[in-house]
Interface confidence: low
């Protein structure tokens, strides 16, 4: 009744949309909670973060395991008081993801 | 004093983080603003959406051109009154992106 090829295409797409670590652009300063007079160049780095869809609305795509990877960035103070310095910055990298229940909105319900 | 190879790696990563169309998982029902008694299987599809970083905080990564691509999905009505039907669903696909100024917070400033 349904064309097998079409179903295969749909299924492949569904697999690709599912909750998994996916390469994401992350803003370093927000990530590290740095003071406003310090910024980084480049301001963003690529890391893997959990994303994608879960089968049910009550589930959310969450990280189950994390590693920290080091990125070399220029740390710059404003006003520019010294030459930008290359510093290693550790950023969270999600290595495992799972569809987990969201925390209940009302803790006593 | 800065290792040229390190700089090359940093620059390549920066290029990859910049504002561009990137494959994203989109929830179809939210996208189409469908009523709660209709849902789709799979619930999500992959399309390209603008994402990534801009050089300045005052700029935001926005789409400058869009195409609409057709995805074959099962549309299901609740309560289930008929066999789930394969329907073509048109979803926005960003084909061009640019770092554009965010709308001013105070329209009269």
């Amino acid at each position: 009744f349904y064309d097998i090829e079409t179903l295969k295409v749909i299924d492949e797409e569904w697999q690709r949309t599912q909750c998994s670590p996916r390469e994401t652009c992350v803003e370093v300063a927000s990530e590290l909670g740095k003071s406003t007079n310090t910024f980084f160049k480049p301001p963003c780095v690529n890391v893997f973060r959990c994303g994608g869809c879960c089968n049910e609305e009550s589930l959310i795509c969450m990280n189950t395991s994390t590693s920290y990877i080091s990125k070399q960035l220029f740390e710059i103070s404003v006003p520019l008081t010294s030459v930008p310095e290359l510093v290693p910055v550790k950023v969270a990298n999600h290595t495992g993801c799972k569809c987990l229940p969201t925390a209940p909105r009302h803790p006593y319900s | 004093f800065y290792d040229i190879e390190t700089l090359k790696v940093i620059d390549e990563e920066w290029q990859r983080t910049q504002c561009s169309p990137r494959e994203t998982c989109v929830e179809v029902a939210s996208e189409l603003g469908k009523s709660t008694n209709t849902f789709f299987k799979p619930p999500c599809v992959n399309v390209f959406r603008c994402g990534g970083c801009c050089n300045e905080e005052s700029l935001i990564c926005m789409n400058t051109s869009t195409s609409y691509i057709s995805k074959q999905l099962f549309e299901i009505s609740v309560p289930l009154t008929s066999v789930p039907e394969l329907v073509p669903v048109k979803v926005a696909n960003h084909t061009g992106c640019k770092c554009l100024p965010t709308a001013p917070r105070h329209p009269y400033s």
């Epitope: 310090t38 930008p84 | 920066w14």
Partner: antibody
């Protein structure tokens, strides 16, 4: 191998504008973190930092001389140009071009500029 | 501006003997990021300055181990354990913690 070379007039008259060019190789001013700057040294005196320009075209000047200085870059030619207006005999110095890292590692050989009528 | 004061102005030395140069800054050179950007350069006659020591005590590559740097805050010292004839020239301290970056007046090291 990083090299920098300064070029410009050896003699300028008081009130004239000095234009110096730094031509460099071994790096690019489009590379992240790169900067080129100028430092001068009057005969037998201390070094004085003048200005520098960064890969993103940010410019920084010594506040004492800011009103007289302009620094610019031509990334495709690997050149940085410094102009200094209203020259005076006290501006007689050897002018050095440097690759701006922390600290300064690579310096040009310097060019002596004499201000005299 | 940060004033960098070097002493002595001139230092006559005997080859094989130690030598010491002092550099004092008008403000602390500890940067907001914790680093101290105090560097030492040697300018040999007719040449451009060359880096010897960076960030107080780190010898730049190729610099002989007879050169050492120390100090903190506002007081810094460059020591040569055994002076050699090739060490003659003018030694400058420099700070790049605060803008404008500034240099000391120089210490001329010459053989007695």
């Amino acid at each position: 191998q990083v090299t920098l070379k300064e070029s410009g007039p050896a003699l300028v008259k008081p009130t004239q504008t000095l234009t110096l060019t730094c031509t460099f190789s071994g790096f690019s001013l489009s590379d992240y973190g790169m900067g080129v700057g100028w430092i001068r040294q009057p005969p037998g005196k201390a070094l004085e930092w003048l200005a520098n320009i960064w890969w993103e075209d940010d410019k920084y000047y010594n506040p004492v001389l800011r009103s007289r200085l302009t620094i610019s870059k031509d990334t495709s030619k690997n050149q940085v140009v410094l102009t200094m207006t209203n020259m005076d005999p006290v501006d007689t110095a050897t002018y050095y071009c440097v690759q701006v890292t922390n600290p300064f590692v690579f310096w040009g050989e310097g060019t002596l500029v004499t201000v005299s009528s | 501006d940060i004033v960098m004061t070097q002493t002595p102005l001139s230092l006559p030395v005997t080859p094989g003997e130690p030598a010491s140069i002092s550099c004092r800054s008008s403000q602390s050179l500890v940067h907001i990021n914790g680093n101290t950007y105090l560097h030492w350069y040697l300018q040999k006659p007719g040449q451009s300055p060359q880096l010897l020591i960076y960030k107080v005590s780190n010898r730049f590559s190729g610099v002989p181990d007879r050169f050492s740097g120390s100090g903190s805050g506002t007081d810094f010292t460059l020591k040569i354990s055994r002076v050699e004839a090739e060490d003659v020239g003018v030694y400058f301290c420099s700070q790049s913690t605060h803008v404008p970056w500034t240099f000391g007046g120089g210490t001329k090291v010459e053989i007695k």
